[in-house]
């Protein structure tokens, strides 16, 4: 695009005689003060004719010359008021003022939108002295204008504590539309309407919007920015973008993918992290979430034993941390385990089923029908019991542990005996006479020691006193008589 000046700006001489811009040798500048590195712009707007009415601040000097004639009021000469140009072009504009030579140390500063422009701007002030006045031209150039250069520029000069201000020069940088709001990627429910927003600005205005869906234009005619597109619903993923048009051309937004929420894919890689007799710790890798966050997961557990009734236990858990401890399982049992997870749309299919086994556990019940009696002739205590039900052994029985505590006149002594798994009776030596013997028995598997039976007490008399009556804990529902030897 060609740089434009919408207000005519022809160079006019400031003073009679050659204009400084012609750089004749007898009028070369006395002093040139660059504020930054010299640059020759693509376009220069020079001051316009002097003597036109002026709206900027005017300083009226109090000093008079030898002839006592008052000096004319000081004011910046009029220059171009509005410069319109395309982005990335160069521009140069200036302020000029004639200052009587009686004033020393005059400096011109540039201001934009009320803030002084300091630092590395391309500002140059040139002085052209004459007999009575010095012409000062302050030039400001921008090598490659950007939108941020838009604004109102003025010159200021201080004389006698008075501030002289030039008329503003409005710089309008025009370019392709610039997006202030672009459509965003979204995950949406199938066949449900949703909105996308697009907003772009100039200058130049107006900016018109066209929406594009999967490479097809949605609106046949331009819509004023900002534009909200109500998409009436999608059945499959789509890509949207918007085109912003102004007199300078077209800018296309980023393309955004709109995904359709779906049920998740099933979890993968379900694995056993740890097994105990009654629990299994599993982990899994979640499947694809279907563009909707996982809410929770369901662990399905069924007994792998072909003789089982096939019932499924279901354990619900949060979706994170992809880990769950399944509890209340039977020991030494085989299970099939599957995992399914859900999002707002629904449940995934179940993961591939995996086989898992619980380990042996300590028995969950004590031996039953414990009977204790004294065999005085051999100075032994005979103990008998019934082994716990197979279901509740939670493993293969390896034996029994017998605890017998002897209490007599403030003395208490506990002894432990281990017995092999085949027997259901044991004999222990009398440790103390005239004492109470308390017996408890626990079944033992490789998984550990089960609970001890309720204590059975028997009194061991001093030598010579016989009591044939046994002590026992009856087995529930067992009506068999207790045999007394």
């Amino acid at each position: 695009a060609i740089t434009e000046a919408r207000e005519e700006a022809k160079p006019y001489p400031l003073f009679p005689g050659p204009f400084p811009g012609s750089l004749q040798t007898d009028h070369t500048p006395l002093l040139s003060l660059p504020h930054a590195s010299g640059y020759q712009p693509a376009l220069m707007f020079s001051p316009t004719q002097p003597g036109r009415p002026h709206t900027g601040n005017v300083a009226i000097p109090q000093v008079t010359s030898v002839e006592s004639k008052p000096l004319p009021p000081l004011a910046f000469k009029h220059t171009v008021g509005h410069i319109i140009l395309s982005e990335h072009k160069g521009v140069k504009f200036n302020c000029s003022i004639s200052v009587p030579n009686i004033y020393q140390d005059t400096t011109i500063s540039w201001w934009k939108d009320g803030k002084e422009l300091l630092g590395a701007h391309h500002a140059i002030t040139q002085f052209y002295p004459d007999d009575e006045v010095t012409a000062i031209i302050a030039s400001f150039s921008i090598t490659s204008v950007q939108r941020s250069d838009n604004g109102s520029y003025i010159c200021k000069m201080k004389i006698n504590n008075e501030e002289i201000v030039s008329d503003p020069i409005y710089i309008e940088v025009q370019g392709l539309p610039h997006f202030t709001k672009q459509p965003e990627s979204m995950n949406v429910t199938r066949n449900t309407a949703f909105n996308l927003t697009c907003q772009a600005v100039g200058p130049p205005e107006p900016v018109n919007i066209f929406w594009v869906q999967n490479s097809s234009r949605v609106n046949e005619q331009p819509e004023k920015s900002p534009s909200v597109l109500t998409v009436p619903g999608l059945t499959e993923m789509a890509v949207f973008s918007c085109e912003a048009h102004n007199d300078k051309g077209l800018t296309v937004s980023k393309g955004v993918q709109i995904n359709i929420k779906a049920i998740p894919s099933p979890p993968t890689e379900v694995s056993i992290r740890n097994s105990t007799a009654h629990s299994i710790l599993i982990s899994w890798v979640p499947g694809f979430d279907g563009y909707s966050p996982f809410r929770n997961c369901s662990i399905q557990v069924k007994e792998a034993d072909p003789l089982s009734n096939g019932s499924v236990m279901i354990f619900n858990t949060s979706a994170l941390p992809h880990l769950y401890q399944i509890k209340q399982l039977q020991a030494l049992a085989n299970y099939s385990i599957g995992v399914s997870c859900m999002n707002e749309i629904g449940w995934s299919a179940v993961s591939p089923w995996i086989l898992a086994s619980t380990t042996e556990g300590a028995p969950s019940v004590a031996p039953l029908n414990v009977t204790v009696f004294l065999n005085e002739s051999s100075d032994n205590v005979d103990i008998r019991w019934m082994k716990p039900p197979t279901k509740q052994q939670d493993g293969e029985l390896v034996g029994y542990r017998i605890s017998h505590v002897w209490q007599s006149a403030g003395i208490s002594k506990e002894l432990l005996e281990e017995v092999g798994q085949n027997g259901s009776r044991a004999r222990i030596s009398v440790q103390v006479h005239n004492a109470t013997c308390t017996v408890r028995i626990a079944a033992v598997t490789r998984g550990g020691v089960g609970p001890f039976s309720d204590p059975v007490k028997i009194f061991i008399p001093a030598h010579g006193w016989v009591d044939y009556a046994p002590s026992s804990t009856p087995a529930p529902g067992n009506a068999d008589p207790v045999l007394i030897i």
């Epitope: 046949e220 005619q221 597109l229």
Partner: antibody
Framework: QVQLVQSGSELKKPGASVKVSCKAS????????VHWVRQAPGQGLEWMGW????????TYAQGFTGRFVFSLDTSVSTAYLQISSLKAEDTAVYYC???????????WGQGTLVTVSS | EIVLTQSPATLSLSPGERATLSCRAS?????MHWYQQKPGQAPRPLIY???NLASGIPARFSGSGSGTSYTLTISSPEPEDFAVYYC?????????FGGGTKVEIK
Amino acid sequence: QVQLVQSGSELKKPGASVKVSCKASGYTFTNYGVHWVRQAPGQGLEWMGWINTYTGEPTYAQGFTGRFVFSLDTSVSTAYLQISSLKAEDTAVYYCARGVRYAYMDYWGQGTLVTVSS
Amino acid sequence: EIVLTQSPATLSLSPGERATLSCRASSSVGYMHWYQQKPGQAPRPLIYATSNLASGIPARFSGSGSGTSYTLTISSPEPEDFAVYYCQQWSSNPRTFGGGTKVEIK
């Protein structure tokens, strides 16, 4: 309310021209395109093309180039369909319709019957 | 251009008997619109963008589909529903109509 009112029926001789008008009211004319649809007697709907009321640029479907011209007078919110060198097979009802997003035609004119007969 | 094929060409129904009208596209389209036309009248918008009822259209009408296959369903047709139905695609120019399905009283 939105309305599209078309001009009345026309009886023309082969080789003549006809200009059908479609006057819009109840909305900003230049915000929506105007589509033209033809329906020959006993036949289905045939999309002829549309005119961009913002730019005045017409788009013609295949088979509707040359003798068919879409035009506008935005000052009176009216779209026109002109057919020149009329043939007997141009006998049809011609409909104008307002086009919105997704090329949906949400309001239709009542139709104009053009009969070409010698 | 995308060719739209409507089937059946004629559907004979008793009032109240469910009507299912099909519209197949020669290649995938983004949305399908449906219009109803009665003899001597201009087409009337029925369904916008595959499944959205136009203003004033009763809920017994519904639309569905995606890709190349679209359906208009009248769950329980009333006497005033006996008419010709046209589908029209949005995806690419030219905008094409199907050949129409006539729903008539058996």
